[in-house]
């Protein structure tokens, strides 16, 4: 009675089970009543990842400078590569076939998550108490100064944009 | 102990102006904001603004902005807020309230005074 | 501007029920750098200022009874008294101090059943 279905890693072809070429390998000829499948080993630059039937092995991916990408991990036999972006740039997407500026945060916002390969900036605006005065990608809103410890009174309150100015305490308004 | 004392109710004509005073005793008033709060019969409470009276810094809630004047005199630890170009809307309950001290972590309103009803009516 | 809105508008309870107020803001309250919540809690009774109860999303303030507490996050809010007593029946407002305009929740009156 010929197979219906076959285990793990083999698949069925002319009513028997044949095996499937492991990770890394391509498929030349299927198994016959007497002969073993023969696989064949992925050329330079290609991969399979799975136990498959393939013919063809997939090509690597190509990280393109031109879209700011780089190597993150080199491909082998069994994996593709894998792309990031350069310095300053964030992946637009999951599969990270392109890349985008890091966006700043604007004065009155400060940085709440720094961007890496793979996410952009994350701002937040600075709450009563903090300031921004610049356009980064990299820094905090930072505290309005203690014009108390330095023994001096403020003469003109903080904003989200701006510190406060201490002046001396003697000043007459 | 922290006190604030209003000034006493006020009856206004429409387009009419109404200065309401608030003192402050038991803490260093030049240091503190200041925050005027309304709030008219059966409404919300509405920010007005603030003033911190040892510099004369303002911040005022963009509704009332050019109509609403807040101002101090550190001499007397009094605030005022002032109203301008009033209408029967602006009849309401008008609070002042302590807010941060300096420390820029009690942004809160700790202690209010005890209110001033101001009613405008023809 | 944030807004505040709060909910319900009005709840009937009696003497000892646990009463929970809820509060959500338009944006987030919670400052990554210091990791608090500009949010506070005020109690009004007809024909006084309001007393403020819970800052910081949930420090009790100094005096108010332990039954009352502050819980929540970001934008989410609730304010729970846990055996509500006759000196409670007022109505309660949140209030967030994260950045100008300060703005206030429309309130929720707690009224006897």
């Known amino acids: 009675e010929p197979p219906t279905a076959c285990r793990e890693k083999q698949y069925l072809i002319n009513s028997q089970c044949c095996s499937l070429c492991q990770p890394g390998q391509k498929l030349v000829s299927d198994c016959t009543e007497f002969t073993e499948t023969e696989c064949l080993p992925c050329g330079e630059s290609e991969f399979l990842d799975t136990w498959n039937r393939e013919t063809r092995c997939h090509q690597h991916k190509y990280c393109d400078p031109n879209l700011g990408l780089r190597v993150q991990q080199k491909g082998t036999s069994e994996t593709d590569t894998i792309c990031t972006c350069e310095e300053g740039l964030h992946c637009t997407s999951e599969s990270c076939e392109s890349c985008v500026p890091h966006r700043s945060c604007l004065p009155g916002f400060g940085v709440k998550q720094i961007a890496t390969g793979v996410s952009d900036t994350i701002c937040e605006p600075c709450p009563v108490g903090f300031f921004s005065n610049v356009s980064s990608a990299f820094e905090k809103c930072r505290p309005w100064t203690s014009c108390e410890t330095k023994d001096l009174v403020v003469q003109q309150a903080g904003t989200n944009k701006t510190d406060v100015v201490c002046g001396p305490q003697d000043r007459q308004r | 102990q922290v006190q604030l004392v209003q000034s006493g109710a006020e009856v206004k004509k429409p387009g009419s102006s109404v200065k309401v005073s608030c003192k402050a005793s038991?803490?260093?008033?030049?240091?503190?904001?200041i925050e005027w709060i309304r709030q008219a019969p059966g409404q919300c409470l509405e920010w007005m603004g603030s003033i911190l009276p040892g510099s004369g810094s303002t911040n005022y809630a963009q509704k009332f902005q050019g109509r609403v004047t807040i101002t101090a005199d550190t001499s007397t630890s009094t605030a005022y807020m002032e109203l301008s170009s009033l209408r029967s809307e602006d009849t309401a309950v008008y609070y002042c309230?302590?807010?941060?001290?300096?420390?820029?972590?009690?942004?809160?309103?700790?202690?209010w005074g005890q209110g001033t009803l101001v009613t405008v009516s023809s | 501007d944030i807004q505040m809105t709060q909910s319900p508008s009005s709840v009937s309870a009696s003497v000892g029920d646990r009463v929970t107020i809820t509060c959500r803001a338009s944006?987030?309250?919670?400052?990554?750098?210091?990791?608090?919540?500009?949010l506070a809690w005020y109690q009004q009774k007809p024909g006084k200022a309001p007393k403020l109860l819970i800052y910081w999303a949930s420090s009790l303030q100094s005096g108010v009874p332990s039954r009352f507490s502050g819980s929540g996050s970001g934008t989410d809010f609730t304010l729970t008294i846990s055996s509500l007593q006759p000196e409670d029946f007022a109505t309660y407002y949140c209030q967030h101090y994260y950045s100008y305009p300060w703005t206030f929740g429309c309130g929720t009156k707690v009224e006897i059943k």
């Open positions: 309230a302590r807010g941060d001290d300096g420390s820029y972590v009690r942004w809160y309103f700790d202690h």
């Open positions: 944006q987030s309250l919670l400052f990554s750098v210091n990791q608090k919540n500009y």
């Open positions: 038991g803490y260093t008033f030049s240091t503190s904001w």
